[in-house]
């Protein structure tokens, strides 16, 4: 395997970790593969300090997550535990809200406008951040 | 200058198997994700494998699941497509295609012909 | 999947002319769009991506425009290596896909 020492070109670094910032949008599972692409996942926030540092970049814009809820319990892609992890919902969230008229509840997290967590249709195209952190041995597969 | 080299194209019997290989030179092969996309003669493009970087993450077109294999050893800078179970419509001219910024196919190799025919 | 319906399929026009192809995405791609440039034998060569942004080193007379579903690419002043085949292909969803593409020939 090889480690990446240094983030990749546009990408910012903070705290040991890389973040990409999407200037346009896709749905949740598009943006998570994406991310995958890039040997990256789409953001997992871990503390109020990544909050803030993610929060700045994105501005007042709606902004995918890697926190969803299409399999049952909420979930980090990177399996982070949710019940004793960090949450900055927005107050009554999340409400698997079946009022849109898309069909289904809402499944994937996003950033608002300020800053703090709503559930949304996971098809809705909205931006969103990737992360990859440093110092961690990427796993190549060997070949066949 | 990027540089893309496909081989390992040629004439293969229906069932059969074939390896492709791509030699990339000029750019951070490690760092940048590959494709393969094929054109059948006379036809339009049709993407048909990515893999990151690591080699971690790949990609497949369903009409190709199961019988193509993509992959890469990035000490030797190459790009690989195992073809296996090879049928008359995978006749094509094989590209291999860097990803670029914001994964656009930013560049190509010249292509590598696959004929399968009994 | 993702489909995508280039128009026309083939254009004749002189040089000098202005064409417009245009591509349509079955169901909306925002501005995950780019278009390429094939000459007979030959790799495809990117134009623009980002369905508006020129690639560094491709000649201004390009360009692109559209979002969500319509698309069209702009040739502004046709030159003689120009008369080839064109296609769109959209990065929004994999599998990523392209259009049949349209060639633009010598009237």
């Known amino acids: 395997g090889s480690e990446r020492t240094c983030c990749p070109v546009n990408w910012v670094e903070h705290e040991r970790s890389c973040y990409w910032f999407s200037r346009s949008g896709k749905a949740w599972a598009d943006a998570d593969n994406y991310c995958r692409l890039e040997d990256a996942h789409l953001v997992v926030v871990t503390s109020w300090e990544e909050q803030k540092f993610v929060q700045h970049h994105i501005g007042p814009v709606n902004t995918w997550m890697g926190l969803h809820d299409q399999n049952g319990p909420w979930k980090w892609v990177d399996g982070t535990d949710y019940e004793t992890g960090f949450k900055n919902w927005r107050p009554e969230q999340p409400d698997d809200w079946y009022g849109h008229g898309l069909g289904g509840g809402e499944d994937c997290a996003h950033f608002t406008d300020d800053g703090r967590w709503n559930d949304d249709v996971c098809q809705r195209p909205y931006r969103w951040v990737c992360e990859t952190e440093l110092d961690k041995a990427s796993q190549e597969p060997p070949l066949l | 200058e990027v540089q893309l080299l496909e081989s390992g194209g040629g004439l293969v019997q229906p069932g059969g198997s074939l390896r492709l290989s791509c030699a990339a030179s000029?750019?951070?092969?490690?760092?940048?994700?590959m494709n393969w996309v094929r054109q059948a003669p006379g036809k339009g493009l049709e993407w048909v494998s990515a893999i990151s970087g690591s080699g971690g993450t790949t990609f497949y077109a369903d009409s190709v699941k199961g019988r193509f294999t993509i992959s890469r050893d990035n000490s030797k800078n190459t790009l690989y497509l195992q073809i296996n179970s090879l049928r008359a419509e995978d006749t094509a001219v094989y590209y291999c295609?860097?990803?670029?910024?914001?994964?656009?196919?930013?560049?190509w190799g010249q292509g590598t012909l696959v004929t399968v025919s009994s | 999947d993702i489909q995508m319906t280039q128009s026309p399929s083939s254009v004749s026009a002189s040089v000098g002319d202005r064409v417009t192809i245009t591509c349509r995405a079955s169901?909306?791609?925002?501005?995950?769009l780019a278009w390429y440039q094939q000459k007979p034998g030959k790799a495809p060569k990117l134009l623009i991506y980002s369905a508006s942004s020129l690639q560094n080193g491709v000649p201004s007379r390009f360009s692109g425009s559209g979002s969500g579903t319509d698309f069209t690419l702009t040739i502004s002043s046709l030159q003689p290596e120009d008369f080839v085949t064109y296609c769109c292909?959209?990065?929004?969803?994999?599998?990523?896909?392209f259009g049949q593409g349209t060639k633009v020939e010598i009237k």
């Open positions: 295609a860097k990803c670029g910024r914001e994964q656009w196919l930013d560049y």
């Open positions: 169901q909306n791609i925002t501005s995950w």
């Open positions: 000029g750019f951070t092969f490690r760092n940048s994700a």
């Open positions: 292909q959209q990065a929004n969803s994999f599998p990523w896909t």
